[in-house]
């Protein structure tokens, strides 16, 4: 749930959590499932050519509170959502890219030439 451009990080669990991983699978993952003491996440961001790329995986408890806060980054369109309520909960996360700012419409074509 986002308010004012931020998403609140969910509460961590007292047991290991399994998450779906895609484009972000650590070495210890098996069959696109990773495990964590923190959160599952799904993230959407623009690649260098402006195409949306969806990534999902595990975030360790250490530092994930910050990572799960969807703090806007200048000149970078991305959105992340985190969950812990059940295993592979990130299968049901569907973050959307934040809308283009007016500046981006002006700058966009120049950057992508």
């Amino acid at each position: 749930k986002k308010e004012d451009g931020e998403s609140t990080a969910p509460t961590p669990r007292p047991k290991i959590l399994r998450c779906k991983c895609h484009h972000h699978c650590p070495e210890d993952s098996v069959n696109n499932i990773c495990s964590t003491d923190g959160y599952c996440f799904t993230m959407i961001e623009e690649d260098d050519s402006g195409m949306p790329v969806v990534t999902s995986g595990c975030l360790g408890l250490e530092g994930s509170d910050f990572q799960c806060r969807d703090t806007p980054i200048p000149h970078q369109r991305r959105s992340i959502e985190c969950c812990t309520e059940r295993n592979e909960c990130n299968k049901d996360l569907h973050p959307t890219l934040p809308p283009l700012k007016n500046r981006d419409f002006v700058d966009g074509p120049i950057h992508h030439k």
Epitope: I16, D28, I33, D37, R86, E88
Partner: antibody, heavy 116, light 112 residues
């Protein structure tokens, strides 16, 4: 205190199936995974798989897929493992064990004997 | 699967001696979260295993301080500073970093 109660022994015929039980007490059942481990004399310990009682999510050792099926009944805080198409190779002690990030408590084990 | 190699298979000791048991994994047990999920258990005859040490070096509640664990990556050690009669049994190392979770073959601690 944490307790995992298992029947002491089961005797079944080859080709049959058996459903082993593990009744948990002394903690919130849905707050931990339940694992199952096989021990045969001289063969060490083998991890069969695990189930999260909060959402019935299971993970299996590839070696036991098709052999073992893990389920839970949260109303009675009981975990079950069904073993099918039994052969003498399935004769062993089977332990249930509580798992958070590591196994901290084990059941006393059920000795399964497969014999005609 | 990760292979856990335990040495020695048998360890004859005198009561009061120090004992060391070694465990080597076929790949690193450092999890992507930074934790190392390597644990030690003691199984006495006719009993189920009991947790001694979790995550390399943390003593489980009620475990005497004569037990200590150390190591990193792929090489781990369990030390018993002064062996007592109640310590006799089979010691297993176990990893829960990689699925399927695996165990060492065991080290039997016995009286010399």
């Amino acid at each position: 205190q944490v307790q995992l109660q298992q029947p002491g022994a089961e005797l079944v015929k080859p080709g049959a199936s058996v459903k082993l039980s593990c009744k948990a007490s002394g903690y919130t059942f849905t707050s931990y995974w339940m694992q199952w481990v096989k021990q045969r004399p001289g063969q060490g310990l083998e991890w069969i798989g695990e189930i999260d009682p909060s959402d019935n999510y299971t993970l299996y050792n590839q070696k036991f897929k098709g052999k073992a099926t893990l389920t839970v009944d949260t109303s009675s805080s009981t975990a079950y493992m069904q073993l099918s198409s039994l052969t003498s190779e399935d004769s062993a002690v089977y332990y249930c064990a509580r798992f958070g990030y590591y196994v901290d408590y084990w059941g006393l084990g059920t000795t399964l004997t497969v014999s005609s | 699967d990760v292979v856990m190699t335990q040495t020695p298979l048998s360890l004859p000791v005198s009561l009061g001696d120090q004992a060391s048991i070694f465990c080597r994994s076929s790949q690193s047990l450092v999890h992507s979260t930074g934790n190392t999920y390597l644990h030690w258990y003691l199984q006495k005859p006719g009993q189920s295993p009991k947790l001694l040490i979790y995550k390399v070096s943390n003593r489980f509640s009620g475990v005497p301080d004569r037990f200590s664990g150390s190591g990193s990556g792929t090489d781990f050690t369990l030390k018993i500073s002064r062996v007592e009669a109640e310590d006799l049994g089979v010691y297993f190392c176990s990893q829960s970093t990689h699925v399927p979770f695996t165990f060492g073959s065991g080290t039997k601690l016995e009286i010399k």
